[in-house]
Amino acid sequence: PGPPPGSPRASPDPRAELDSTVLLTRSLLEDTRQLTIQLKDKFPADGDHNLDSLPTLAMSAGALGALQLPSVLTRLRADLLSYLRHVQWLRRAMGSSLKTLEPELGTLQTRLDRLLRRLQLLMSRLALPQLPPDPPAPPLAPPSSTWGGIRAAHAILGGLHLTLDWAVRGLLLLKTRL
């Protein structure tokens, strides 16, 4: 090998990567908030809705301080993968009923996928442990009725909103440690 010529900076520094990940998460949080408003407007919810297949909220914002970088990113990635799967399921299962939300749901899915890629890239650049995703869960059963699907949509968007809110806080905290 010859003398080291050096390389031009080809890609963002992990700290810059973290900044852009925070921006993407914030924009996804806003997308989710707007979609939730639209959904409530078109299909008013009667109270809170749950879906057993959704991940439980990773952590209260107050308990974030004790977390380590790898556990935050690993958990966040696992939860977001689950939400991506649920959004895909929702679009397939409820195509006609949720037609009015379709362009936005499609955008949400695309941005969620992009955020997952960013998180993985960040973990690679920092050389943090990358646990394999959980084994594929059994396919989600189609909703029993249109209203069942709408309740599921409320649960998915509500849970995703909470997770992304947690994610923004967590990523901002991690930035101070990097």
Epitope: G6, A10, D13, P70, S124, R125, A127, P132, P133, L178
Partner: antibody, heavy 114, light 111 residues
Framework: EVQLLESGGGLVQPGGSLRLSCAAS????????MHWVRQAPGKGLEWVAV????????YYADSVKGRFTISRDNSKNTLYLQMNSLRAEDTAVYYC???????WGQGTLVTVSS | QSVLTQPPSASGTPGQRVTISCSGS?????????VHWYQQLPGTAPKLLIY???ERPSGVPDRFSGSKSGTSASLAISGLRSEDEADYYC???????????FGGGTKLTVL
Amino acid sequence: EVQLLESGGGLVQPGGSLRLSCAASGFTFSSYGMHWVRQAPGKGLEWVAVISYDGSYKYYADSVKGRFTISRDNSKNTLYLQMNSLRAEDTAVYYCAAGVPDYWGQGTLVTVSS
Amino acid sequence: QSVLTQPPSASGTPGQRVTISCSGSSSNIGSDYDVHWYQQLPGTAPKLLIYSNNERPSGVPDRFSGSKSGTSASLAISGLRSEDEADYYCSAWDSSLSGPVFGGGTKLTVL
């Protein structure tokens, strides 16, 4: 401009030891995970070891586990590879690389031969 | 034996489009881990060509593109040039090894 400069390679007898160093400049060394990757003459790339940005996580290829140790000194912007119990099959150009890896050094040749 | 499988060689004439494949398994590419591609010109160190399946680092021409599906990935080079003659390697994280794995490399010849 990003620079990774490896040193410490050379000729060593089987069973011997060698310590490679990699001096980094032009980027925030302490924000990057760092790798050692090797390439035997005329062969492909083989990942050797990785250390996380803060040194808290270290992983090794099975072929070097228990013989090689990766470490870093963020205050000196330097990565190290301590190689013990060297074998003929460890003969290769050893590259230090940062991130994905995004950046690579030019490599240092390690020859294990009697 | 490399963990990721690539064809040992590929070739094309100037201006042509060439594709190099990279096949993995459920512990690497199939586990939703991203694929990265490297170019190694004769006598030099590898250089990152594509990261995160299809992203190009600054300075890499848009003639180079990547894609991924299931447990495999591919690198496409369009408008082939003589300076593209090099070895190309794919790489992905492998959960069973807790580290990145590389393909065996593909030697691209521009005829």
